[in-house]
């Protein structure tokens, strides 16, 4: 996911409605103006605001990667959802970017857990059904299975 | 004259509570956000918290809790109510006038309040 | 809560020398950033805001860059009067992620 940077919103289009703040706070889907007088709204597919805020600018949309598809649109007052296409997955200490999921487990393990979009599969050794590290095994050591598949 | 003008300051004892007064000249504080700031002897500048124009309160963290920003329109002053003082809470406080898009533009000279037995 | 990042925490310089000063915050602020000027016993002075935008009375020889997270003040031609401390401070959001204030940088006579 590419988060861009912070859309600033100096001047008000015509279209983007005005309130006022409400305990110096703008509602969610908006910014506050300049001088702290209005409430602007995000404009719809560009920038969003997700909480109360005295926020100056509306968060600009995330784009979806090239091997993500967007699960929901951004509105003004959420981001865009994107998640790895099929056969590949997001972990959580690096999130940055989709990996493709390993084809199979190691020999002597087992599949246990398919590939989602946040997980890779799972394996875990026959005799004393402990989880893999998740390290890449070397091909030659590869029990491949197509997806959703278990291993034999 | 333009002017911030903070008084209050001096010496209390730990556990102690004390108001600081930022009377405010050429302008009018309910029509501006207001901040206070603390620094400690040779520290940085530690950010307190703001009222805004409509009276609303926020803190840092450090300060919730303990200190309370209030304004009193009719005499153009800004308050800091502070309870439970530490030996940590030693420093010049500084209330200053907040402009939302172009920051902290105007100070006041700053009080000092000293925290110890 | 934003937290700025300032540096360096004191630096060295002699009349004449251009100086650099970086600022970078936790997440982007966009250019709603200021930079105030503190000499020993009085109160923090505004120099720059909105990242770049000179405040009135102060001389040109101050500048100020960046956008997003990472941020520059700059003294093109260090004069005696600005040996002091920086300090630079977001301006978005005071309410919503406070108003803390970068650590500061002491500039000093080398």
């Known amino acids: 996911i590419t988060q861009q940077d912070l859309a600033p919103q100096q001047r008000a289009a015509p279209q983007q409605k005005r309130s006022s703040p409400s305990e110096g706070l703008c509602p969610p889907g908006h910014h506050i103006s300049e001088d702290g007088r209005d409430c602007i709204s995000c404009k719809y597919g560009q920038d969003y605001s997700t909480h109360w805020n005295d926020l100056l600018f509306c968060l600009r949309c995330t784009r979806c990667d090239s091997g993500e598809v967007e699960l929901s649109p951004c509105t003004t007052t959420r981001n865009t959802v994107c998640q790895c296409e099929e056969g590949t997955f997001r972990e959580e200490d690096s999130p940055e970017m989709c990996r493709k999921c390993r084809t199979g487990c190691p020999r002597g393990m087992v599949k246990v857990g398919d590939c989602t979009p946040w997980s890779d599969i799972e394996c875990v050794h026959k005799e004393s059904g402990t989880k893999h590290s998740g390290e890449v095994p070397a091909v030659e050591e590869t029990v491949t299975s197509s997806p959703g598949t278990p291993a034999s | 004259e333009v002017q911030l003008v903070e008084t209050g300051g001096g010496l209390i004892q730990p556990g102690g509570s004390l108001r600081l007064s930022c009377a405010a000249s050429?302008?009018?504080?309910?029509?501006?956000?207001m901040i206070w700031v603390r620094q400690a002897p040779g520290k940085g500048l530690e950010y307190i918290g703001f009222?805004?124009?409509?009276?609303?309160?926020y803190y840092a963290d450090s300060a919730k809790g303990r200190f309370t920003i209030s304004r009193d329109n009719s005499k153009n002053t800004l308050y800091l109510q502070m309870n439970s003082l530490r030996a940590e809470d030693t420093a010049v406080y500084y209330c200053?006038?907040?402009?939302?898009?172009?920051?902290?533009?105007?100070w006041g000279r700053g009080t000092l309040v000293t925290v110890s037995s | 809560d934003i937290q700025m990042t300032q540096s360096p925490s004191s630096l060295s310089a002699s009349v004449g020398d251009r100086v650099t000063i970086t600022c970078q915050a936790s997440?982007?602020?966009?250019?709603?950033l200021s930079w105030y000027q503190q000499k020993p016993g009085q109160p923090p002075k505004r120099l720059i805001y909105k990242a770049s935008t000179l405040a009135s009375g102060v001389p040109s020889r101050f500048s100020g860059s960046g956008s997003g997270t990472d941020f520059t003040l700059t003294i093109s031609s260090l004069q005696p009067e600005d040996f002091a401390t920086y300090y630079c401070?977001?301006?978005?959001?005071?309410?919503?992620?406070?108003?803390?204030f970068g650590g500061g940088t002491k500039v000093e006579i080398k």
């Open positions: 009222i805004t124009s409509d009276g609303s309160t």
């Open positions: 997440q982007s602020i966009s250019t709603y």
């Open positions: 200053a006038r907040y402009t939302y898009s172009d920051g902290t533009d105007l």
């Open positions: 401070q977001p301006n978005s959001g005071i309410a919503t992620y406070g108003a803390a």
């Open positions: 050429g302008f009018t504080v309910s029509r501006y956000a």
